[in-house]
C-alpha cells in the first residue's frame, strides 16, 4: 500500500492531525523534499548576519555577513572579521604581512612572492604587502642587442642632430 | 578552565534601568566576540545582542534597538549590558556566552561556553 504522504510536495507536510491530508508549511517554515510530516524553521539571518535570500515554503533562508566581515562554514554559519589587504588575521588578531609575502584580499592568509627565477624570469615590479611581484622578461632577453624586448632606434640621416 | 559569571539582575520597574557585568577567566577575552542571550519564563531562548572581539562592531536584537547597549573592557575581562527603558517583556534570565572561533561571530546554536545567568525582573 503506498504511504498517502508520498503525495505531499514540497512546500506542504502531511498532517497526521487532519486524515494525512497535505497542508502548507505554516509561515516561516518551509519543507524542500516533498513527503514531509513536518516543515522546518526557517532560519533568521539576525545581528551580523543578512538576508541573501528569503525564506520560501520550498526553502530556507540564505544568510550572508555585514560589511566587515565575511562568511565561514557551510551555509555561512559564522562571521569572520575582515583585515585590510597586506593584512592577515591571527591570534593576536589583523597583522601586516611580513616581508616577502603579500595578500590582496581581506581575508585569508598572507602568501610569499612569487619566486621569478624559477620560472627563468626577472622582477619587473617589485611585490608590496598588497601585491605580488610582477615577473618580466627573462634576464637574457634584457641582454644588449636582443631586439625582442627593445626595438631598434630608427635610422637617422647623416648630418641631423637629435630633435 | 573557562569560567563567565554574571552580575547586576534584579528587580526593577518598567521605564527602569540595569546594568548586567560578565566576568570571563579562563581563555584570551580579547579574542572573541561575545553575546547576550535571554530566556524569558517558559519560553526559548532569545538572542538578545553580539559584540566583537575588540568592541567596535554591536549587534542587536529588534526588540532592544535604541534601549540596550552591549559594551567590553577587555582590560578588565568583562562584557555589560546596559538596559534602559526596560518593559515587563524583557523580564527573563540573562546569559552571557563566548563564540567558538577567535575574531568570528557565530551562530547561537554554535556558542561554546555559558554563563549560569542572572535574573531580570521588571515588574509594574
Known amino acids: 500500500l503506498q504511504d498517502p504522504c508520498s503525495n505531499c510536495p514540497a512546500g506542504t507536510f502531511c498532517d497526521n492531525n487532519r486524515n494525512q491530508i497535505c497542508s502548507p508549511c505554516p509561515p516561516n517554515s518551509f519543507s524542500s523534499a516533498g513527503g514531509q510530516r513536518t516543515c522546518d524553521i526557517c532560519r533568521q539571518c539576525k545581528g551580523v548576519f543578512r538576508t541573501r535570500k528569503e525564506c520560501s515554503s520550498t526553502s530556507n533562508a540564505e544568510c550572508d555577513c555585514t560589511p566587515g566581515f565575511h562568511c565561514l562554514g557551510a551555509g555561512c554559519s559564522m562571521c569572520e572579521q575582515d583585515c585590510k589587504q597586506g593584512q592577515e588575521l591571527t591570534k593576536k588578531g589583523c597583522k601586516d604581512c611580513c616581508f616577502g609575502t603579500f595578500n590582496d584580499q581581506k581575508r585569508g592568509i598572507c602568501r610569499p612572492w612569487t619566486n621569478c627565477s624559477l620560472d627563468g624570469k626577472s622582477v619587473l615590479v617589485n611585490g608590496t604587502k598588497e601585491r605580488d611581484v610582477v615577473c618580466g622578461p627573462s634576464p637574457a632577453d634584457l641582454s644588449p642587442g636582443a631586439s625582442s624586448v627593445t626595438p631598434p632606434a630608427p635610422a637617422r640621416e647623416p648630418g641631423h642632430s637629435p630633435q | 578552565q573557562v569560567q563567565l559569571v554574571e552580575s547586576g539582575g534584579g528587580l526593577v520597574q518598567p521605564g527602569g534601568s540595569l546594568r548586567l557585568s560578565c566576568s570571563a577567566s579562563?581563555?584570551?577575552?580579547?579574542?572573541?566576540?561575545m553575546s547576550w542571550v535571554r530566556q524569558a519564563p517558559g519560553k526559548g531562548l532569545e538572542w538578545v545582542s553580539d559584540?566583537?572581539?575588540?568592541?567596535?562592531?554591536?549587534f542587536y536584537e529588534d526588540s532592544v534597538k535604541g534601549r540596550f547597549t552591549i559594551s567590553r573592557d577587555n582590560a578588565k575581562n568583562t562584557l555589560y549590558l546596559q538596559m534602559n527603558s526596560l518593559r515587563a517583556e524583557d523580564t527573563a534570565v540573562y546569559y552571557c556566552?563566548?563564540?567558538?572561533?577567535?575574531?568570528?561571530?557565530?551562530?547561537?546554536?554554535?556558542?561554546?561556553?555559558w554563563g549560569q545567568g542572572t535574573l531580570v525582573t521588571v515588574f509594574p
Open positions: 579562563g581563555f584570551t577575552f580579547s579574542s572573541y566576540a
Open positions: 556566552a563566548k563564540h567558538p572561533l577567535t575574531y568570528t561571530i557565530a551562530t547561537m546554536n554554535d556558542y561554546d561556553y
Open positions: 559584540i566583537n572581539s575588540g568592541g567596535e562592531s554591536t
